[in-house]
Interface confidence: medium
């Protein structure tokens, strides 16, 4: 009979014995339970020590289940972070390799002599992507200034250009009034494209990393006193009652687990974070395509060089006006001009057929597709966590057996109290444990803020801006109305807001900078420019 079964502790002895409990501590039959702290003080199979040990074990079981349930989130975000990071870095390497091939073919020996400038550019782009670099404005302005210093003398082999003159030249080129634009619009267009793409890529991989860190921390659940007691009533007390095979009711489990997790949930910030990832992923394979940007770096630089060649008379006149006429090279020291075919090729335009292609091809599309599919499984994770935990056979009866009797916390029967949701408003009515109505605890608030910050950064990057400093959308030239080019991004983009001007002469990487720089006054003549 049922009375006989529940009078015996045989089943409990068998279960706890297998877990390494000393059978001396477990009576063969039920004893009076006045000594119990958590379980009903009725007949029991548990001594005080057994109850205390079971309390610790039930906590560990719960913690383990929560961490196991979320391990796929941590692993997925970590794996996606690694894959996207590798992809973006590979694309920068592919772009550098393509540019080397392109320029070696087009410009021959002259490229080889100046390859360090291009390598330096890619090194600084990597630094910016990896968060250790300076702003892209300065990186790109520096690159074009160095390029001009190397290329301008090649247009005028009959003149000598000492370092002071070259310094005047590069200052003139980076002047905020935009009076000299030796490379035409190419610097602005390249800056716009690279900045939007790198800012987006950086925000995206940072977002994945933040998500992984937040989740792995959030899954380490501290167990409050109330939660600990509720967990014991849920899965420990059936053992003490002598009915270890009587599984807790599903509703009972949901109320306990939701109570234990109530101040730990990351909704609605989690859903917004997933939205941010998806929005930015779409931009990275569409208008902010990393592949297209990587491919076009060489093309845009080449377009700039073409512009300089075609407008060399105008550019030179401006330079000679501002920096003074250069000294002619004595005839005996004059370099022989490069061979005709090389000189012609130096300024040849990169043709469409020569645009570098990448082995990655549709890589990004595949990565984004995989990400979409995985993020779909992550949505609702925190709301579903209690169901996942209660779906484990150690925690509750199978939900499909709801009509069958189960452990209610007091005995065998059906669980009658309402099942409450996970939100603070509902948890106030949790019948199983008193939940702090003030909402998330401090560590959870901090994690939610981290998610919010990552989401804001991603959504801002998706609009073409950088939360960490400069705006990727703004016009860098300092002149004109900030017109957007349809071939850069989407036709019909809104003109960006005006930006405060950059200081006229940013310090150069070699340490020189500031107005005057100790150079001869002759190289700074012309109209004065306030520093």
């Amino acid at each position: 009979s049922e009375a006989k079964v529940t009078r015996s502790c045989a089943e409990t002895r068998q279960v706890l014995g297998a877990r390494g409990y000393s059978l001396n501590l477990i009576p063969p039959a039920l004893i009076s339970g006045e000594h119990l702290r958590v379980c009903p003080q009725e007949y029991t199979c548990c001594s005080s020590e057994t109850e205390q040990r079971l309390i610790r074990e039930t906590e560990a079981t719960f913690r383990g289940l929560v961490e196991d349930s979320g391990s796929f989130l941590v692993h997925t975000l970590a794996a996606r972070h690694r894959k996207f990071d590798e992809f973006f870095l590979e694309m920068l390497s592919v772009a550098q390799h393509s540019l080397t091939q392109l320029f070696s073919h087009s410009y021959g020996r002259l490229y080889a002599q100046h390859a360090l400038i291009f390598n330096g550019l890619f090194s600084r782009l990597r630094d910016f992507y990896g968060e250790s670099g300076e702003g892209l404005d300065d990186t790109l302005a520096d690159f074009w200034a160095q390029l001009l210093e190397r290329v301008f003398p090649l247009l005028h082999p009959q003149y000598s250009f000492p370092p002071d003159y070259l310094l005047c030249l590069s200052r003139l080129a980076s002047s905020t009034d935009g009076s000299l634009q030796p490379f035409g619009d190419s610097p602005r267009r390249l800056r716009l494209q690279i900045t939007r793409t790198l800012v987006a890529a950086r925000a995206f991989v940072q977002g994945l990393e933040t998500g992984r860190n937040v989740v792995s921390e959030a899954l380490k659940v501290p167990v409050s006193e109330g939660c600990s007691q509720a967990l014991m009533r849920l899965i420990g007390c059936p053992l003490c009652r002598g009915v270890p095979s009587l599984m807790p009711c599903q509703g009972f489990c949901l109320n306990v687990v939701r109570g234990c997790l109530s101040s730990r949930g990351l909704e609605p910030d989690w859903g917004n974070y997933l939205d941010g990832l998806l929005i930015l992923a779409d931009k990275l394979q569409g208008p902010f395509s990393f592949e297209l940007t990587a491919e076009s770096i060489g093309v845009k630089i080449s377009e700039g060089l073409m512009y300089l060649q075609e407008n060399s008379a105008k550019v030179s006149a401006q330079v000679f006006q501002e920096c003074g006429p250069p000294d002619p090279v004595p005839a005996r020291n004059r370099r022989a001009p490069p061979p005709r075919e090389e000189a012609g090729r130096l300024w040849s335009m990169v043709t469409e057929e020569e645009r570098p292609t990448t082995a990655a091809g549709t890589n990004l599309h595949r990565l984004v597709w995989e990400l979409r599919e995985r993020l779909a499984r992550m949505r609702g994770f925190w709301a579903r966590l209690s169901l996942t935990v209660c779906g484990d056979s150690r925690m509750a009866a199978d939900a499909s057996l709801e009509a069958a009797p189960c452990w209610t916390g007091a005995g065998r029967g059906r669980y009658l109290p309402p099942v409450v949701g996970g939100s603070p408003a509902e948890q106030v009515n949790n019948p199983e444990l008193k939940v702090d109505a003030s909402g998330p605890d401090v560590p959870t608030r901090r994690r939610r803020l981290q998610l919010r910050a990552a989401t804001a950064r991603m959504k801002t990057a998706a609009l073409g801006h950088d939360l960490d400093g400069q705006d990727a959308d703004e016009d860098a030239s300092g002149s004109g109305g900030g017109q957007q080019y349809a071939d850069d991004w989407m036709a019909g983009a809104v003109a960006p807001p005006a930006r405060p001007p950059r200081p006229p002469y940013p310090p150069r990487r070699d340490g020189s900078g500031g107005k005057g720089g100790g150079g001869s006054a002759r190289y700074n003549q012309g109209r004065s420019r306030s520093g």
């Epitope: 949901l254 949930g265 909704e267 609702g380 579903r384 709801e402 099942v419 509902e426």
Partner: nanobody, 127 residues
Framework: EVQLVESGGGLVQPGGSLRLSCIVS????????MAWFRQAPGKGLEGVSG???????GYAESVKGRFTISRDNSKNTLYLQMNSLRAEDTAVYYC?????????????????????WGQGTLVTVSS
């Protein structure tokens, strides 16, 4: 595992009507709270309407008087009748379910903390 399958979305002219359906593959669903959420292009999730096992219903201000939520326990199905549709109702509509029995009663139906989410059905209101 609970599965949710929405249907009934499509293209409709302003002022027109649509009825969304959501079939829930679990018989205990009668004790669950259910709701419809939507997400317009480039926007966040918005709670449209909720219904709990107690029978209480909740609606977003923007749809009150135009949308009606209901359920048929014998068919395990949740419905959303949408009348007088406007261009701003264009969105992907999601059916959501949670074992909490009284989300509307407790005033938390519009928070997107639901355990199960459908794949969504697109509603486009355009002339």
């Amino acid at each position: 595992e609970v599965q949710l399958v929405e249907s009934g979305g499509g293209l409709v002219q302003p002022g027109g009507s649509l009825r969304l359906s959501c079939i829930v593959s679990r018989y205990t669903y009668a004790t669950y709270s259910m709701a419809w959420f939507r997400q317009a292009p480039g926007k966040g999730l918005e709670g449209v309407s909720g219904l709990d096992s107690v029978g209480a219903t909740g609606y977003a201000e923007s749809v009150k008087g135009r949308f009606t939520i209901s359920r048929d326990n014998s068919k395990n199905t949740l419905y959303l009748q949408m009348n007088s549709l406007r261009a701003e109702d264009t969105a992907v509509y999601y059916c959501v379910v949670d074992p909490a029995s009284a989300k509307v009663t407790y005033g938390s139906w519009s928070t997107p903390s639901y355990a199960y989410w459908g794949q969504g059905t697109l509603v486009t209101v355009s002339s």
